[in-house]
């Protein structure tokens, strides 16, 4: 099967690579404009340069292109607790990221939010923290995992899902009620 | 068994208002993030808010931020999303989800769903 092509793949394709076709005159291909720059004017004819210019502070483009516009620099989102790690440039976008110690939990694609990494008080570590992915915990006797952090088993009532790990516990405590906390 | 059980859905003109309710069971509510999924007809699934255990943390996806508001009662082990000025783009089947946190975008577990219909 054929992948269906956008109008611009199309016209595209009919040129050698590094090249477009003019948007006007499709006998005429025109040099892409590099990295860094956006397309000003096409091409005035065969061989003759495509007028592109520096994109302008505060935008950028990442790759070989004929955008009429350079894009926009991305933001790095404070109230997610990002921090940038390189600024944009000419011809790379923003780079956000997290604090050290903390991990990144994606809402969307393209938009995470940062939180920190867990301890593992009470506990040993069983996978260290990594940039997309919680510290995984082993708690130690007498203490559960909950929401990957180790909390003592005197916080565990009969009904909630901590009583198989501190079942020794729970048995011990004679003639408590059972609270029906869920 | 987690049980997540959603209400408050239906038809609202464009402006109006809704709140969603989720009633959970089965798991320690007070322990979890919780939020709410939607998935608008042929579209993929999207966060459209979250809540902390403690509810001292938010998120809002930016298309509701200021519009909408999350919020939960612990007490009552119940999630709720009050929607104002709904636009014709927030139709969907809103869900009540066990926020999974690490990686994703992910959608943790989640209820049966409720429908809100936007329309004139």
């Known amino acids: 099967l054929v992948p269906h092509l956008g109008d611009r793949e199309k016209r595209d394709s009919v040129c050698p690579q590094g090249k477009y076709i003019h948007p006007q005159n499709n006998s005429i291909c025109c040099t892409k404009c590099h990295k860094g720059t956006y397309l000003y004017n096409d091409c005035p004819g065969p061989g003759q340069d495509t007028d592109c210019r520096e994109c302008e502070s505060g935008s950028f483009t990442a790759s070989e292109n004929h955008l009429r516009h350079c894009l926009s620099c991305s933001k790095c989102r404070k109230e997610m607790g990002q921090v940038e790690i390189s600024s944009c440039t000419v011809d790379r976008d923003t780079v956000c990221g997290c604090r050290k110690n903390q991990y990144r939990h994606y809402w969307s694609e393209n938009l995470f939010q940062c939180f920190n990494c867990s301890l593992c008080l009470n506990g040993t570590v069983h996978l260290s923290c990594q940039e997309k992915q919680n510290t995984v915990c082993t708690c130690h006797a007498g203490f559960f995992l909950r929401e990957n952090e180790c909390v003592s088993c005197s916080n565990c009532k009969k009904s909630l899902e901590c009583t198989k790990l501190c079942l020794p516990q729970i048995e011990n405590v004679k003639g408590t009620e059972d609270s029906g906390t869920t | 068994e987690v049980q997540l059980l959603e209400s408050g859905g239906g038809l609202v003109q464009p402006g109006g208002s809704l709140r969603l309710s989720c009633a959970a069971s089965?798991?320690?509510?007070?322990?979890?993030?919780m939020g709410w999924v939607r998935q608008a007809p042929g579209k993929g699934l999207e966060w459209v808010s979250a809540?902390?255990?403690?509810?001292?943390?938010?998120f809002y996806a930016d298309s509701v931020k200021g519009r909408f508001t999350i919020s939960r009662d612990n007490s009552k082990n119940t999630l709720y999303l009050q929607m104002n000025s709904l636009r014709a783009e927030d139709a969907a089947v809103y869900y009540c989800?066990?926020?999974?946190?690490?990686?994703?975008?992910?959608?943790?577990?989640r209820g049966q769903g409720t429908l809100v219909t936007v329309s004139s």
């Open positions: 989800a066990k926020v999974k946190l690490g990686g994703g975008p992910n959608f943790g577990y």
């Open positions: 089965g798991f320690t509510f007070e322990w979890y993030w």
């Open positions: 809540i902390s255990g403690s509810g001292g943390s938010t």
